[in-house]
Interface confidence: low
């Protein structure tokens, strides 16, 4: 029964993030005659994939197509036979390829060539596997967002998102925080961008948008965690790592080989006495904290504002949908709730780092120990990034939502990045495309 | 140096047992989860079974369900597989392998049966042990 064909007239299409830590399969579904309506495109599957993310396996590229294999399929079942050879399929890479292209253009080259390859064999319409930038990450998040959120409808919703209703066309702020990268994209009240690198000129719908946004590629989770891993080494007496992000008596091995792999802490690389060393926890919100605000450089600016690292920031404007790691670590945390206050939040991150291991291990025992272990990094992380890296502040704080899905569909740049390909976003009625895209690759 | 070495491989006749042992040396066993994986002889790697970190999940590839069972024990750093009712198709080597990577969040929490792909995801191997079933 799957395979066959609807009785109503419905398009399908797909986007694959392949990100730092793994990937991810969107199949998207919209009434045919209403493409260009705003908000009709709403998920109907995600498939995680099995496995790292794509860039783990420039060694290894022939195992590529197993590792896609299982999605693919799922994806053949959902959507109905008579619908393959019209749906498109689009590869998105984000940061992780972005990493690994900066080691190795051709090695980046030969796993997305494979990734095409494989991409190719099934039914479906294939589009092309590319690298986006970190731009268009920040700008299709926002997309995304406002697009399910009604923002950039003119008319009377059809739907009510009741915990972010505004009752207004001011349109949300994206905060994205992925594996590798971190993105910030807002409408800023006061439209002076002052780096052209940031700025972001739409016509969506019939009104202008000029969007700042930005992506500190090296600052996700996962490669803040080894900056400030490879920066709390250097001072180190020996290869004990006594590590406040870490719950009291957590022990890990740790690689030198591993630590230096990537790009991200080259800045911190040096010649260590040892090849291993081992991380034991002090479990210490406040130093944690500490430590991590040494990742970011604040004593140069070179604009009126700034985030960290010399980048320009304007001053916050609005509410902010905060997606991917930031709704994922703070939701295990239990600390979306709009409720809470950021003065809270701090508070419950000092108590949930100052918790044994013992007993956080046996407090969440169905939960893989390796993520277990860094929860406390990453809500420190999280509320560093926030407060110290982006200037909001406690009064602002109750501006940032968390947000897992907005009418059942992912918040992320994947389904912003489709109906840009696929010319559903018209720009009066439908004329022009909100962002160009580059050649695949 | 970290490493992990398996041992216990050896010739059994069909219905018979074996214990395969997997210890490591440079790291603690407890903080990671441990797969086993076998490779016949002409064929691509596959995911057997698997343990938690903690011990309280295994997991087991439908072919072996039933017949073998993983196991640690903390005080010798030492992860096991016990091989019962072996069959000739159990034939093949028997590989450990350690999920080490220090990068956070590389998966959700998964099943650790599967062919290469998975293969790909863990870190650290040893160099095999060879179990061959025959009468």
């Known amino acids: 029964t799957q395979n066959k064909a609807l009785p109503e007239n419905v398009k399908y299409g797909i986007v694959l993030d392949a990100g730092s830590s793994h990937t991810s399969l969107y199949i998207y579904k919209w009434p045919a005659e209403k493409e260009n309506d705003t908000g009709v495109v709403h998920q109907v599957e995600e498939c995680r994939v099995k496995g790292p993310g794509i860039s783990k396996f420039v060694q290894k590229v022939n195992e590529i197509g197993i590792y896609l294999t299982d999605c693919m399929e799922r994806a053949r079942e959902v959507i109905p036979r008579s619908q393959h050879q019209e749906t498109p399929v689009y590869l998105g890479a984000t940061a992780g390829m972005r990493l690994l292209r900066m080691e190795s253009e051709e090695l980046a080259d030969r796993v997305l060539d494979v990734v095409e390859r494989s991409l190719s064999n099934y039914p479906f319409d294939f589009q092309g596997a590319r690298i986006i930038t970190g731009q268009e990450e920040g700008a299709y998040g926002w997309i995304t967002i406002n697009y399910l959120l009604g923002k950039f409808s003119q008319k009377t919703r059809w739907f009510s998102i009741v915990p972010y209703e505004t009752n207004n066309q001011e349109t949300f702020g994206a905060l994205d925080l992925g594996g590798a990268s971190t993105q910030v994209t807002f409408v800023p009240q006061n439209q002076t961008i002052e780096s052209p690198d940031n700025a972001l000129q739409f016509r969506l719908y019939g009104k202008d948008y000029n969007v700042y946004t930005h992506s500190f590629l090296c600052y996700g989770k996962d490669q803040a965690l080894w900056q400030k891993l490879a920066k709390d080494i250097q001072v180190a007496s020996n290869e004990i790592l006594r590590d406040p992000c870490f719950h009291p008596g957590y022990k890990k091995v740790v690689n030198v080989s591993d630590l230096y792999k990537t790009p991200c802490t080259k800045r911190f690389e040096m010649t260590l006495p040892f090849q291993q060393f081992e991380i034991q926890g002090i479990g210490n919100y406040q130093q944690c904290h500490q430590s991590i605000l040494e990742l970011f450089n604040t004593s140069y600016c070179p604009y009126s504002q700034c985030a960290f690292n010399g980048i320009f920031l304007p001053p916050l404007q609005g509410d902010f949908g905060a997606f991917s790691a930031f709704y994922f670590v703070m939701k295990f945390l239990n600390l979306t709730s709009e409720k809470v206050s950021q003065e809270k939040v701090t508070e419950m991150m000092k108590k949930f780092c100052a918790q044994p291991w013992e007993e956080i291990k046996t407090s969440y025992a169905g939960v893989k120990e390796k993520y277990l272990s860094e929860y406390c990094f990453s809500g420190t992380y999280i509320l560093s990034l926030l407060l110290q890296g982006y200037h909001f502040t406690a009064d602002s704080w109750e501006h940032i939502h968390f947000i897992g899905k907005i009418q059942g569909s992912d918040a992320g740049w994947t389904l912003g990045y489709m109906l840009n390909l696929t010319n559903m976003i018209p720009a009066e009625q439908p004329l022009s495309t909100p962002l160009s895209h580059s050649t695949y690759v | 140096e970290v490493q992990v070495v398996e041992s216990g491989g050896g010739l059994v006749q069909p219905g018979g047992s074996l214990r395969l042992s997997c210890a490591a040396s440079?790291?603690?066993?407890?903080?990671?989860?441990i797969a086993w994986f076998r490779q016949a002889p002409g064929k691509g790697r596959e995911g057997v079974s698997c343990?938690?970190?903690?011990?309280?999940?295994?997991n087991y590839a439908d072919s072996v369900k039933g017949r073998f069972t993983a196991s640690r024990d903390t005080a010798k750093n030492t992860v096991y597989l016990q091989m019962n009712s072996l069959k000739p198709e159990d034939t093949a080597v028997y590989y450990c392998?350690?999920?080490?990577?220090?990068?956070?969040?590389?998966?959700?929490?998964?099943?650790?049966?599967?062919?290469?792909?998975?293969?790909?995801?863990?870190?650290?191997w040893g160099q095999g042990t060879q179990v061959t079933v025959s009468s």
């Open positions: 343990i938690s970190s903690s011990g309280g999940s295994t």
């Open positions: 392998a350690a999920d080490l990577s220090a990068a956070p969040y590389n998966d959700a929490v998964r099943s650790c049966t599967g062919g290469n792909r998975l293969a790909a995801t863990y870190d650290f």
């Open positions: 440079g790291f603690t066993l407890d903080y990671y989860a």
